[in-house]
């Protein structure tokens, strides 16, 4: 549905989006897995958390993440199509006081301990570009998504509409 540089165009206004209210519209505890059904797991190592993408053994318990959903408002003069638009943004917290953060300089996804209000690096625009899968786009870096690289989460630049459905940026949410 995009032109040549569609991803850059449609995300241009993300920098200026304002999150309406400080409380989430809903929260949802779910396990996170890749399109290929590998689990996203979190391990405490040397007083910091590491994020892994791995196959779990049968009956091994999946790690849960608290997804907090916020509504973000675009005034029509920013949305580019004359319409006041709304989007869903999420924060992801696998354990109390820790949130996934986008480290745009290192192209990495990290767990940081922080207090509310959370920094913009902890917010991701929610997409469901593929049936029953979601993608997470950095609020601070439009066109950059959480993805899987070398069995870790990383930030992946998506430079064309075709790549929006590339499997390594697609995730499944499950309550089980």
């Amino acid at each position: 549905a995009f032109g040549i540089s569609g991803v850059q165009k449609y995300t241009r206004a993300l920098h200026d989006s304002s999150i309406t209210g400080i409380s989430p519209i809903t929260e949802y505890l779910a396990s996170l897995s890749t399109y290929n059904d590998q689990s996203i797991t979190f391990a405490l190592e040397d007083e910091s958390y590491e994020i892994y993408v791995e196959d779990l053994k049968k009956d091994e318990k999946k790690d849960k993440v608290l997804l907090s959903y916020y509504e973000s408002q675009h005034p029509s003069n920013e949305s580019g199509d004359g319409v006041d638009g709304k989007m869903l943004m999420v924060t992801l917290s696998p354990t109390k006081d820790f949130w996934l953060h986008a480290n745009n300089k290192e192209h990495s996804v990290e767990l940081h301990k922080c207090e509310k209000p959370l920094p913009d690096q902890a917010f991701f625009v929610l997409h469901n570009m593929h049936s029953n899968c979601v993608s997470f786009e950095c609020k601070t870096d439009p066109g950059v998504f959480i993805g899987v690289k070398d069995n870790h989460l990383a930030l992946i630049k998506v430079d064309s509409s075709e790549n929006l459905c590339t499997e390594n940026i697609l995730f499944k949410l499950s309550e089980t």
Partner: antibody, heavy 121, light 107 residues
């Protein structure tokens, strides 16, 4: 303002292909998904499929073998084709736009007025 | 597919009455439920999204509650223009199924 307008023949013969077009204005297909929904006379609503903002398409599996959804960005149009129709496909067909940018979680905020398609010989 | 069961299928009420419509999902859908109002010969109109959020321009007498599998639409004080059919819809996973509808009629 946001508008969606369905158009196409009101009468289709059994075994033929039903073709409808949804012409949109006031918003961009690169930001919002457009869905097709139908409603047989006197009955409830049935979701048929969606053209998502990224250009991917999801179908109702019950109709997947007969249904094709496509787009023409330059004309701001989304098309629906339903093949091998029978009398059971007689319905008002609606197109509708997502409430949220990039996702369908917020339901359908804007609807076309609907177009009645009758399948009869 | 997720089945959505609405009850009652119809309700007779008077202006000023409080009306409650319930929707039950066959599996958990989080908060991803919408409610629509449809009048004869018209397109559906979004009333509530994300289970509890009031859509733009919808009067505050409409409210939504619930999460997981059980959801409720409440009209606190029924007005003449509220006589219509109401549908719930789950948006957690495709196909995005609707309830069968609840017709609110004049008593």
């Amino acid at each position: 303002q946001v508008q969606l307008q369905e158009s196409g023949p009101g009468l289709v013969k059994p075994s033929e292909t039903l073709s409808l077009t949804c012409t949109v204005s006031g918003f961009s297909l690169s930001k919002y998904g457009v869905h097709w929904i139908r409603q047989p006379p006197g009955k409830g609503l049935e979701w048929l499929g969606v053209l998502r903002a990224g250009g991917t398409i999801s179908y109702n599996s019950a109709l997947m073998s007969r249904l094709t959804i496509s787009e023409d960005i330059s004309k701001s149009q989304v098309s629906l084709k339903l093949s091998s129709v029978t009398a059971a496909d007689t319905a008002v067909y609606y197109c509708a736009r997502d409430h949220y940018y990039y996702s369908s979680f917020g339901g359908f905020a804007s609807w076309g007025q609907g177009t009645l398609v009758t399948v009869s010989s | 597919d997720i089945q959505m069961t609405q009850s009652p299928s119809s309700v007779s009420a008077s202006v000023g009455d409080r009306v409650t419509i319930t929707c039950l999902a066959s599996q958990t859908i989080g908060a991803w439920l919408a409610w629509y109002q449809q009048k004869p010969g018209k397109s559906p109109k979004l009333l509530i999204y994300a289970a509890t959020r009031l859509a733009d321009g919808v009067p505050s007498r409409f409210s939504g509650s619930g999460s997981g599998t059980d959801f409720t639409l409440t009209i606190s004080s029924l007005q003449p223009e509220d006589f219509a059919t109401y549908y719930c819809q789950q948006l957690n996973s495709t196909p995005y199924t609707f309830g069968q509808g609840t017709k609110v009629e004049i008593k």
